[in-house]
Interface confidence: low
């Protein structure tokens, strides 16, 4: 029959070429001479010329070695024609299967694989997976079936079988306990992939296993005992740097130190922070230390890590003896700001108050006093006793120096230490009002018509405080009452001035006496311009010849 079974041809054949594979045969050759030909990829289309057919005999020929990894199967068509070119058979399918030879080694997908595993993990923990491929056939043969193995391990500590690799998946796992990053931070495994399921060609790659840090080492103080000297009163003063060593990975949470003052800081005077680079504990004063109260502190500091320990580890403790050094401290006014009530206008030489300072130092130091700032120059201070006396007139109504009835003075105390130190205090004199100002009208110049005149309302002001102010009383003097009247309104804070008789156009003096609730009297001359006009006027109309 005009049929050919699939033909199997091994790749990489040695020849000689052309090599006869199979013979095409049509039973029509009994009747006529038959010519044979083949078509298809590998014959008359790319890759052309791999196969040919002997035109007359029908022998199918292979012209060159085949490569299964390039083309694994060829599908050709056989044709049979008579001498006159007429087709005598239907085109016949010819399948040529290229059988595999183990001509490709396995290839790892990377030259170097990288993985990591935590130190101290249990055997069986998976680390990483490596992969190798082989272009040969792995379905019908073992040529492309890859088996993995570990050829060598560097270093061989704690022994040479720390890892295993799954023969078929390439998964690398821990096989032994004892992974310790502090001893071996990285292993280099030479891994092999062998085809023929382990019996064939081998290729190698490197698997680098990084051992990740676990917090299995406690930080340790070195040294454990410290002595430090600190001047009293210093805040934020660096007392001591505490040094620790930690075998875990530098700059990791398992290495970074956390310090805690466990004891000896009852007054909460100290604080400890971690230096970000050196990992040292920096002990500083949170508050000033007081030599007079306590001249030595013994602190106990414990160190741990930012990360918790993965197993129970003993913690390291350091002892720091802090010696407080005496410092000549400044005298302190008691209270720092003193409020004293004093009547304004007291006589010169009159005592105002005594304002003294205390020296925190234990020795009985002599303190001397002086006034540092006295804007109006109203006061003096005895250098020995701190007695403040008036040397000028204290005036509550002096707006340049007095604000809200308070006159502020700064005083200074100086001890006789070496070197001497000074402290300042603030003396706030609250000036008590005295009825030393009479009422004053505003404005003091008026313009008024001599016909149907408008009443002139004048505001009354008094620099003193109540009760030395309203209600006010008004009185006209020096015959001013012949032409004018003056009346204080019901509220008692304005005076109404009225023209009661005709005056010719001119300028007149009106003598107005105002007295306050404390009968303090003040005479004021009001300058009144009288105009020839009716009712309300601002200025006199027409030519004005008045003086």
């Amino acid at each position: 029959d005009w049929v050919v079974a699939p033909i199997s041809v091994p790749e990489n054949g040695k020849g000689p070429f052309p090599q006869r594979l199979n013979q095409l045969k049509s039973n029509k050759d009994r009747d006529t001479k038959i010519f044979y030909s083949i078509t298809g990829p590998g014959a008359d289309s790319p890759p052309e010329g791999v196969f040919a057919v002997e035109k007359e005999t029908g022998w199918l020929l292979l012209n060159k070695p085949l490569d299964r990894e390039e083309i694994a199967k060829y599908e050709l068509y056989g044709h049979a024609v008579s001498e006159n070119g007429a087709s005598v058979e239907e085109p016949m399918n010819i399948s040529i299967i290229v059988t595999d030879q183990n001509d490709n080694k396995p290839k790892f997908t990377q030259d170097t694989f990288r993985g990591s595993v935590l130190e101290g993990v249990l055997p069986g923990t998976s680390v990483m997976q490596v992969t190798a491929t082989d272009e040969d056939d792995a379905i019908y043969t073992y040529n492309g079936v890859v088996a993995y193995s570990i050829h060598s391990q560097e270093p061989k500590d704690p022994h040479d079988l720390m890892f295993t690799i799954h023969r078929s998946t390439g998964t690398i796992s821990v096989i032994s306990s004892g992974l310790d990053r502090e001893k071996v931070p990285e292993y280099t495994l030479t891994i092999q992939a062998t085809d023929m399921d382990g019996d064939g060609s081998t290729t190698t790659a490197v698997a680098v296993v990084e051992i990740l840090d676990a917090n299995d080492n406690a930080p340790m103080f070195d040294p454990q005992k410290y002595e430090a000297h600190v001047p009293e009163n210093a805040v934020g003063h660096e007392v001591q740097r505490l040094t620790v060593t930690d075998l875990d990975a530098p700059n990791s949470p398992a290495w970074r130190a956390t310090y805690l003052i466990m004891g000896g800081d009852d007054g909460d005077h100290f604080t400890i922070t971690t230096h970000p680079e050196s990992n040292q504990g920096i002990l500083t004063t949170r508050k000033g230390l007081d030599f007079e109260a306590k001249n030595q502190h013994t602190l106990y500091v414990e160190v741990t890590n930012e990360a918790p320990f993965v197993l129970k580890l003993p913690t390291s403790t350091a002892t720091i003896v802090v010696h407080v050094e005496d410092v000549n401290e400044a005298p302190v006014f008691v209270p720092p700001s003193k409020v004293v009530e004093v009547q304004e206008g007291i006589p010169t030489g009159e005592p105002v108050c005594v304002y003294t300072a205390e020296d925190p130092d234990k020795e009985n130091q002599k303190i001397s006093y002086r006034i540092l700032r006295d804007p109006a120059g109203w006061l003096a201070m005895d250098p020995d006793s701190g007695q403040v006396t008036a040397v000028g007139t204290l005036d509550r109504e002096d707006e340049q120096f007095v604000r809200n009835n308070i006159y502020e003075v700064m005083v200074l105390a100086m001890d006789n230490g070496s070197p001497p130190t000074t402290g300042t205090g603030t003396l706030l004199l609250t000036l008590i009002d005295v009825n030393d100002h009479g009422p004053v009208p505003e404005p003091r110049q008026i313009t008024i018509c001599n016909q149907s005149p408008v009443r002139q309302v004048l505001n009354i002001t008094d620099k003193d405080l109540s009760p030395h102010t309203s209600p006010f009383q008004a009185q006209l003097t020096d015959d001013s009452d012949i032409y004018w009247t003056a009346e204080v309104n019901e509220e008692g804070d304005t005076v109404v001035l009225s023209l009661k008789k005709f005056l010719k156009q001119d300028t007149y003096d009106v003598h107005l006496s105002l007295s306050d609730h404390g009968n303090k009297e003040q005479l004021t001359v009001i300058r009144a311009t009288v105009c020839d006009c009716h009712g309300h006027v601002e200025t006199c109309p027409g030519p004005w010849k008045g003086g």
Partner: antibody, heavy 121, light 107 residues
Framework: VQLVEQSGAELVKPGASVKISCKAS????????MNWVKQRPGKGLEWIGR????????KYNGKFKGKATLTADKSSSTAYMQLSSLTSEDSAVYFC??????????????WGQGTRVTVSS | ELMMTQTPASLSASVGETVTFTCRAS??????LAWYQQKQGKSPQLLVY???TLAEGVPSRFSGSGSGTQFSLKINSLQPEDFGSYYC?????????FGGGTKLEIK
């Protein structure tokens, strides 16, 4: 007996190319790497690169990328190295050498006799 | 790139003496080092691979040692045929590099 036979000496002009060959016999050519090594007169050895004839995979020393091209013909068990844009610096003896797999990594166990290339106008 | 440094560059010795060549790698190459002998006008011959394994047919007076970055080749009781140049080469991962060589001459 494993043998690695190299082609004869070449005299070439500057700027030209040359292709030298290395024929292997007595072992599985397809499944062993073939390496190429350069030796200038009176100097040491320089590794150029290698090829795996089974699938044509190549690895080069960066210094020779673009200068050397490695190929192999499985059917004739022959490895080739083409050197291009030749200058006097390329005048040297070129060796091919088989790299055998010892189950770990590789050393060069069979060497060709060397091909002398002289670049001169 | 891995650098291989060989010392000394040249050495004079007499037949019967013992000589040692050293080779230093710029980084850890574990045991992946080979030694080759080359005589004038000839191709190199493999002596030692994997730092200490003698190649087939190499006399037992040759011995290799070392790992990591420091390696040495020792020849006991020098024979006349031992004179020539000796090269180390790492065979860890490409690119493979050779040392500059040591020339062994008759004193």
């Amino acid at each position: 007996v494993q043998l690695v036979e190299q082609s004869g000496a070449e005299l070439v002009k500057p700027g030209a190319s040359v292709k030298i060959s290395c024929k292997a016999s007595g072992y599985a050519f397809s499944t062993s790497w073939m390496n190429w090594v350069k030796q200038r007169p009176g100097k040491g050895l320089e590794w150029i690169g290698r090829i795996y004839p089974g699938d044509g995979e190549t690895k080069y020393n960066g210094k020779f990328k673009g200068k050397a091209t490695l190929t192999a013909d499985k059917s004739s068990s022959t490895a080739y190295m083409q050197l291009s844009s030749l200058t006097s610096e390329d005048s040297a003896v070129y060796f091919c050498a088989r790299q055998r797999d010892y189950g770990a990594l590789y050393a060069l166990d069979y060497w060709g006799q060397g091909t002398r290339v002289t670049v001169s106008s | 790139e891995l650098m291989m440094t060989q010392t000394p560059a040249s050495l004079s010795a007499s037949v019967g003496e013992t000589v040692t060549f050293t080779c230093r790698a710029s980084e850890n190459i574990y045991s992946y080092l080979a030694w080759y002998q080359q005589k004038q006008g000839k191709s190199p011959q493999l002596l030692v691979y994997n730092a200490k394994t003698l190649a087939e047919g190499v006399p037992s007076r040759f011995s290799g040692s070392g790992s990591g970055t420091q390696f040495s080749l020792k020849i006991n009781s020098l024979q006349p045929e031992d004179f020539g140049s000796y090269y180390c080469q790492h065979h860890y991962v490409p690119p493979y590099t050779f040392g500059g060589g040591t020339k062994l001459e008759i004193k």
